[in-house]
Structures are given as C-alpha cells and as structure tokens.
Interface confidence: low
C-alpha cells in the first residue's frame, strides 16, 4: 500500500547521480537509482519502442526511503542517449538527467519520430525548422547537407545551429528548394551521416470557405439537411474542418470530410466537408458555422437553418388591392408572401391565366412594361404550397389613368380667321381617365402673346385670363359640359360660345386629372372681311363644277390672292394648333384666279370645271388692308364628295292598314350626286294628288284616308348618273269600303 504525504510537502525524487548531464561510453552499463516519498516510475528515451527487454527497473531497499527504484541498461548504444526521468506515479513532480552515450561509430540518435524521416516546412522568412538529428556526443561538429542541388549548411553561431538534444536548426526557406536533407559529422577523419529526411513544403493559405446552400436554408421538420462546406487552399495544405451547430436533441448529425479533385490547370487544392442530418427537428434550427483550419490560418462561413414545424403559406403585409398607373408607364405588382417551401405562383387577369410575353412578365412580381388602357382589370395571384397544396389568393385591381387628350389637337382647324361680328363656337373634346368634371377656358388678346412657329407650343402668352373675366375681349358663354360616346370612349365636350367676334384673341381649354394635364390653344383671328363662299353647293360631288369666291370690300382691301394648303405646307399643321396662315404664305401654293368687281366689292374666283377628290383641302384667301398694309387671311375647307351609285339601305316593310287610316313610308336611299327618287304603284308612276303627298325630295310617301284601291305593290326607285336602285313594299288594305252619299 502506498503511504505518502500530501502533495504540498513532497520533495522531488533524489537520483544517485548529482549531475544534470551524464556522459558514458557505448557498451558500458548505465545504472541510476531514484528515491522518493511515494510510488515512483521511470521514463527513458524511446520507451515506447521495444526497449523494455534491455531496460531493467528494480525495487531497491536500504537507505532512509521505502520508495526506491533502480534503472539498469547493460551495453548501452548511441540510441540510448536522451532524458531519463524519475517521477511520482500520481503527482507531476520529477527529477531528470540527460545521458549521452558516446558512440563514435553512430554519433546520431534515431528517435521514434525519425521513423517517418519527413520534415515539414513552410516557406516563411521568419520560420525556422529543426532537422531532428540529435547526437550521442554533445560537442560534435555537425553540418547539414541538402540535395538536389547539393548544398551544405554549417552552424554560424546565429540562425544556423546544432544542439545534440534538439538537432539541426536553420531558417526553413534555406532548404525549401531541397527534396531531402541529412546531418553529417566528422570524427577522426571518419564521416558519419544521420538518416535521410524528406523535405515537404507545407502551405497554409486558405483562399475561401464556401457554404452550399449559401443563404438561409428553410426546411420542414422531417426533411433532410445537407450542408456542403468547400475550402479552396494553396497546394500542400493540410486542413481540419470543425462544425458549430445548435445543440441537437438527438445525435443524428453526420460529417464526412474528403479531398476534391481541383479543376485542371488550377493551382489550388479543394477540401469538402459535408454535414448531413437525415431528418431535422425543430431543435436543429439555428446557426451553422463551418470552420476550416490549416494550422496557421482559419477561415469560416456561416448560414442559418430555419426549421418549420409544418409547411405554410400566407401573404405578407403591404400587398395592395388597388394599383393605379398612368398610360405608358411601367407597372410592377410585387407578391409579398411568407411560405415554406417556396410557393407556385400563378397570375390571372379577369379569370384568365397570364403567361409571360414581351409586354408582361409574371413571377414573384407582375411587370407590365408599358401599360395601356386595355391592361386595366382585376389581376389575381394564387399561391400554392407545393407540399400541403394549401392555396392563398389575392386580387389586385389595376386602374389605368389617362392624362387628358384633346381630340381636336390632332385635326386641322378648318378656320383660321373669323368674320367680324359673327357668333362663333369653339369646342374641346377631351378624353381622360379618371373622367373630367371641369374643363377650364382661358383667353388673352392676340397682341399680348408671341408666336414662334415650329415649336410644340407655338403660342406664348405671359398670362392667361379666365373666360369669366372678358373685359376688353369678346363676350363669352361657356356651355355646360356634354358627355358623348365617341369611338367607343366616353368623352367630355366643352363648348365656348363667342357672342360676337369683335377682338382677335387666343383661347385655351385646359383639362387636368390625376394623371396629367392637356391643353389646346385656339387662334381666334377676327377680320372685317374678306368672305369666302362656295358655289353652287357647299359640298359638291366629284365631276361637278365648283367655284370658290373670295369677296372683299374694294375700299378697304387690295391684292386679293388665293392659296392652297398643300403637302409642302404641312409644317403649318404641326404643334399644338394651326399656325396663322397669314404669317406663312410663302409656304403655300399660289393659285390663279379670275377677278370680278361690282359697285362695292372685288371678287376673286377659283373655278374647278370638273372637281376631283384631289381638289379637296384647305384654301386660303388673302387680302391686304389698304391703310395698314396688314394681311388678312381666311381659310375655307373644301370637301368634295365621292361619286356613289344609289343604294337603298335596308328593306321597305310591308304595311297592313284599314280603310281611312294614313300610310307613311320612307325610301332610305343614298348616293352621290343625290339620287332622284320616283315612286311606282303596280309599275305605274305615282303622281301627287289630294291624298298622295311626296316630301323630302320624294323620299317620304304619305297616303291619307286610305281607300281599298290604294292597296298594291309600291316601288321606290333612286337614280343618279351612276345608275338606279329599287325597293318594293306591299300595302294591304283591310275592311269594307263605306258607301258614299253619291251612291
């Protein structure tokens, strides 16, 4: 039984030799005795190698200690060189002696680790490496040989040294080129070599550590988690992986580390560590960190694993139910949802599925590249959880707003000048969404505004006055807005009535809604003559003769000239409104006219003997004021109607009536020139009498106080120079003829 004092009072074991270093010759016997106050143990060099049969440890009595052990090694060899340690068995208190076994035939000791014969070095200027060629003789002259190429290193008392207990020390970069090294000692002209050491240059740089999947991972309880951690390093790197993960309730994590074949041509090494959990539970939720260490360098990467107890799907906040957009803009309707796993997203418009195309892209958000009015409607997004198949739907109404568009802006105004004293009507037809409640009218005197042709807004007025303030201008009345369905769109029509055209002015209609504003500026140029008339009819038909007459007071005007607005004058029509043609006469076609005079007026006539469709257009009559030399212009739009053979649209209905009633029938004929209509009864031409009335150019036939003999087949025939068209109707007269007094 071991008896002893508490550790506090223990003295180190006592050795039989007083020296710290003991030198003995090879082949002699080494014997050291150790005494102490507790159970003792001996430890000697290469103890783990099979040396026990040569080493004898025996109990020894005598002296004042009952704890005593003697170590004996007969016939020592150079390899027995090293530290001999006697220590207490259960307390870390010991005494050591270093023994050199001087063996001139084998001055280098082969240690246990030397069996590998490998020296690992790093290419680092500041690092030193130890080649463990320890010696059995302390004062040897040792050099280090490196090859290939052959190079010898000798201790320099500084960074290169040899110590019998350690080996040969030198900066590692000095031998990084070498494939192998060995130590060499000279004793009595005899050369002795240590074992060969292979030099392995070890890298340490870790370029990066990549986790896959890279971002937050979402799983449902029971699913498999696989995390791959890939490290890229420089060559000759040894790597250790460590995973830090939430403390799991069950030990079901599996980690597999392996080297990965790098891509050809890359000067990098790749390592992969895979963490697998076959069936995750809620307790596996948390942060997972992969740490890669090369000894000198550590790199890490982390990800968050979220474990849901079950699949779910729900919309997040901020999903709009109404989206408003302006025509032409890009519309984006994002879907905000919370889901595991990611949902299938389907979009529908007014109940019909939407597929992506070049104008519309569907997915996590609906994108309409350039929204049109046709895109307005109800859009429904349906999210489906692919595991639970739970569905959530949300509807978004898309309202497409249209800034006010004023229809007349696109047209050429048929008038540029207005006759003094006449009543005139100006109109703005506006389409907008949301529809307009108000269209504002403004005005300004013509001389208070400047005119810049070719600009998008050719008129510039410093300020506009509201039409209610018509002081100094024309008396105005704005009629109540009317709403009309034009080209399938609900439009607002605002009319400005000028009671008497007395002053030249500019009028502006302005419409504003939430999508924007629109305006139209109308030039209202008032002249006291000239006047234009069209003879013989206001709207002649092609191949008819037609004359344009421009009449001006001979005392006021001179230099009457006709012009036609042609294709080379299109710049006149550009921009916000019609350019005042008087300011741009050089751009017009001058026409030859015939001048007539009467007692008060000059009349300039342009005659078309055989009018064609090419003759229609805008004609300008220009006259110069004799006093002021100011030109006055008037525009007339000449419309030539195309020739058209007669046509009777629709059928004439058969009519049944009783004696004494009235029959009315209309012949719905059209054509150009206006057809001449003739009625026949039973193929006999019908003539007017007291009971038969023909009206509206024979278009309407009325038979009053019908008699039995008025029944029969009536035919309406419409004829012009291009031909005739006919339609028939049957009149049936019921009832008996009353006897007259004459009978």
């Amino acid at each position: 039984a071991s008896v002893g004092l508490p550790g506090d009072f223990l003295h180190p074991p006592k050795l039989s030799t007083q020296k710290d270093i003991l030198t003995i010759l090879a082949n002699t016997t080494l014997q050291i005795t150790c005494r102490g106050q507790r159970d003792l143990d001996w430890l000697w060099p290469n103890a783990q190698r099979d040396s026990e049969e040569r080493v004898l440890v025996t109990e020894c009595g005598g002296g004042d200690s009952i704890f005593c052990k003697t170590l004996t090694i007969p016939r020592v060899v150079g390899n027995d060189t090293g530290a001999y340690k006697c220590s207490y068995r259960d307390v870390d208190i010991a005494s050591t002696v270093y023994v050199y076994v001087r063996d001139y035939r084998s001055p280098f000791i082969a240690s246990v680790s030397d069996q590998h014969g490998i020296v690992y070095i790093t290419e680092n200027k500041n690092k030193t490496v130890v080649i463990p060629c320890r010696g059995s003789i302390s004062n040897l002259n040792v050099s280090l040989c490196a090859r290939y190429p052959e190079k010898r290193f000798v201790p320099d008392g500084n960074r290169i040294s040899w110590d019998s207990e350690i080996g040969f020390t030198l900066p590692s970069y000095m031998i990084s080129y070498a494939g192998m090294v060995f130590c060499e000692a000279k004793i009595n002209d005899e050369t002795y070599q240590s074992i060969m050491y292979i030099v392995v240059v070890v890298g340490y740089r870790i370029y990066d550590v990549i986790l896959s999947p890279p971002h937050e991972i979402e799983l449902s309880a029971g699913e498999k988690l696989v995390l791959n951690c890939t490290a890229r390093t420089e060559l000759n790197v040894g790597l250790d992986f460590t995973w830090h993960s939430p403390p799991s309730k069950s030990h079901h994590k599996k980690i597999v580390n392996r080297d990965v074949k790098p891509f050809p041509g890359t000067v990098a090494k790749m390592f992969l560590s895979t963490l697998t959990i076959e069936s995750v539970t809620k307790s596996d939720q948390g942060e997972y960190t992969c740490v890669a260490s090369s000894g000198r360098m550590i790199k890490r990467n982390r990800t968050f694993v979220r474990v849901h107890t079950k699949p779910f799907i729900a919309f997040g906040s901020g999903m709009k139910s109404l989206v408003e957009a302006t025509v032409g803009s890009q519309v984006r309707i994002p879907v905000k949802y919370l889901s595991y796993p990611a949902p299938d997203i389907k979009w529908y418009r007014n109940g019909r599925p939407i597929e992506s195309n070049y104008t519309m892209i569907v997915g996590d958000e609906l994108t309409i590249m350039e929204v049109t009015e046709r895109d307005a409607g109800n859009y429904t997004v349906i999210l489906t959880n692919p595991i639970s198949m739970e569905k959530q739907s949300h509807m978004v109404s898309l309202v497409v707003n249209v800034p006010p568009q004023i229809g007349e802006k696109a047209l050429i105004s048929p008038m540029d000048s207005y006759q003094y004293g006449t009543m005139q009507t100006l109109t703005c037809t506006v389409y907008a969404n949301p529809p307009l409640h108000h269209i504002q009218w403004y005005w300004q005197l013509e001389e208070a505004c400047s005119y810049r042709p070719g600009q998008t807004s050719p008129y510039a007025c410093k300020e506009w006055r509201h039409v209610e303030d018509f002081q100094g201008g024309n008396k105005i009345e704005v009629t109540k807005n009317q709403y009309a369905l034009i080209e399938g769109k609900n439009k607002t029509v605002s009319t400005l009535v000028i009671q008497a055209a007395n002053v030249s002015a500019l009028y502006k209609c302005e419409a504003i809604n939430k999508a924007g504003r629109g305006e139209r500026v109308i030039s209202f140029h008032v002249i006291r003559g000239p006047e234009i008339t069209v003879q013989p009819a206001a709207q002649p038909t092609e191949q008819e003769s037609v004359s344009l007459l421009c009449t001006a007071d001979r005392n006021t005007f001179e230099n009457l000239t006709w012009y036609k607005l042609g294709s080379q004058a299109t710049s006149v029509h550009m921009g916000e409104s019609l350019t005042p043609v008087c300011k741009n006469l050089d751009a017009l076609w001058k026409l030859n006219g015939t001048m007539f005079s009467n007692s008060t007026n000059d009349i300039l006539i342009v005659a078309f003997q055989n009018a064609s469709l090419q003759d229609q257009g805008d004609y300008v009559c220009s006259a110069q004021d004799k006093k002021t030399k100011k030109r006055h212009c008037l525009v007339k739009q000449l419309i030539i109607l195309e020739r058209m053979a007669p046509m009777i649209t629709g059928n004439l209905e058969n009519q049944t009536t009783t004696i004494g009633e009235t029959i009315e029938v209309t012949c719905p004929a059209s054509g150009n020139p206006t057809p001449h209509i003739t009625w026949f009864k039973d193929n006999e031409t019908l003539v007017e009498d007291s009971g038969i009335v023909l009206r509206d150019g024979n278009r309407n036939l009325t038979i009053r106080r019908v008699r039995k003999e008025d029944g029969g087949l009536y035919t309406c025939q419409a004829c012009n120079v291009l031909g005739c068209a006919r339609a028939e109707t049957l009149f049936i007269i019921e009832g008996a003829q009353e006897k007259t007094n004459l009978e």
Epitope: K282, G286, A314, F315, L338
Partner: antibody, heavy 119, light 111 residues
C-alpha cells in the same frame, strides 16, 4: 412548455422598470417571443416581439418606450420611462406552433405580472 | 396600421344556442387573423389561427371564417363556460413593417 413573468411592482413615473419572462421547455434560439399588455378593465394591446435570431419588432406606438432583449432562458421587457398610462398586466407569449417565423398568434401565455405606475 | 373593429359588447346567447362575433379589418390582412378567449383574471387562450384553423385542444363548437376583410367567430352549442371576452388579432410581417394588433374585444353573455 411554460412561461412566467416577474418584476411587476409599483413604480413612480419616469423610473425605468424591467420585466422578465422565464421560459421553460422552449428553445429561444428557435422561437420568437412576444409581449402583450392589458390595462385594468381594457383590451389586449400588442407591444412587440423578439425573433428567434434576436431581431426586435415593436408596435408603432411602443417604439422608443420599450426595449425587448433575451438570454438563453429569459426574455426581458424594459419600460424605459413609465407613465401612468403604462399601468397594466404584462403578458409574455409564444407561438410554439411556429407557423412561419414571423406570423405570431400566441398559443402559450404566461399568467401575467401587474405593473402600477403612480406618483 | 391595421385597425380591427369588433362587434359591440355584450353579445347574448342561450345555452345550446349559437353566437357570432365579427371582426372587420381596415385593410387586407389575408388569412392572418387569430381569435382568443379570455375570462376575468385569466390569461388569454388561443381558439382559432389562420382565420379558420382550430387550435389544438379547442372544441369543434368554435369555428372561424373569412370573407375579404371581414372575419367571423361562431360558437355553437353554447355552454355556460363560454361566457368570456373574445379578442381577434391580426398578425403579419414584412421586411419593413409589422402589424400585430388586437380588436377591442367582445363580451359574450350566456343566459
């Protein structure tokens, strides 16, 4: 799984007060915790919550007035500068169902702790 | 922020009968609504979540439904133990805001 609030007492206006919710059987690194209060005779009022990752979210009226923090087993609610309007029973609550990390209805509630703010 | 408007208190029902409580949301909250029961001096108890899903351990006499932004809690086969105050709660989250509000509560009286 259970929750228990503590720290409720009578305080004077302006004196900071911290309430603690002690958690049993719930891993706070996996679940979010919320705080709800109820003034005497009044309805429930949501204050805020702390997510599993430690992010905090507050009702707009509670921002700056309350601070939520947590350790591995407790969740604290600090009333930074109490006023008499803060007199209420304070509940801590948890969504142990975990219907998504941020969809918080509460299926586990503590019994509540009463805070009285009076001068 | 979302405002939840509940049926005015009290709502009365006879034992064995049915009562319905309505909760109107001021904006779309989808199905993100829960119902709670609270008796005097006690902590609230979850009845319904996700507008219509029954919480575990809650009798099937309790049911929830949604129509747009209007939510309804129906208690059928009314029992004396159902006398309590019932609260609706909206809950949802997005990266930039959270809205997690309770309705004002509706007291149910059982005759």
């Amino acid at each position: 799984q259970s929750l228990e609030e503590s720290g409720g007492r009578l305080v004077t206006p302006g004196t900071p007060l911290t309430l603690t919710c002690t958690v049993s059987g719930i891993d706070l690194s996996s679940y979010a915790m919320g705080w709800v209060r109820q003034a005497p005779g009044k309805g429930l009022e949501w204050i805020g919550f702390i997510s599993s990752s430690g992010s905090t979210y507050y009702a707009s009226w509670a921002k700056g007035r309350f601070t939520i923090s947590k350790t591995s087993t407790t969740v604290d609610l600090k009333i930074t500068s109490p006023t008499t309007e803060d007199t209420a029973t304070y509940f801590c609550a948890n969504n142990y169902d975990d219907y998504g990390d941020f969809l918080h209805y509460f299926n586990i509630w503590g019994p509540g702790t009463l805070v009285t703010v009076s001068s | 922020a979302v405002v939840l408007t509940q049926t005015a208190s009290p709502v009365s029902g006879a034992v064995g009968g049915t009562v319905t409580i309505k909760c109107q949301a001021s904006q779309h909250i989808y199905s993100n609504l829960a119902w709670y029961q609270q008796k005097p001096g006690q902590r609230p108890k979850l009845l319904i979540y996700a507008a219509s899903k029954l919480a575990s351990g809650v009798p099937s006499r309790f049911s929830g439904s949604r129509s747009g932004t209007e939510f309804t809690l129906t208690i059928s086969d009314l029992e004396c133990a159902d006398a309590a105050t019932y609260y609706c709660q909206s809950y949802y989250y997005s990266s930039d805001s959270t809205d997690n509000t309770f309705g004002g509560g509706t007291e149910v009286v059982v005759k």
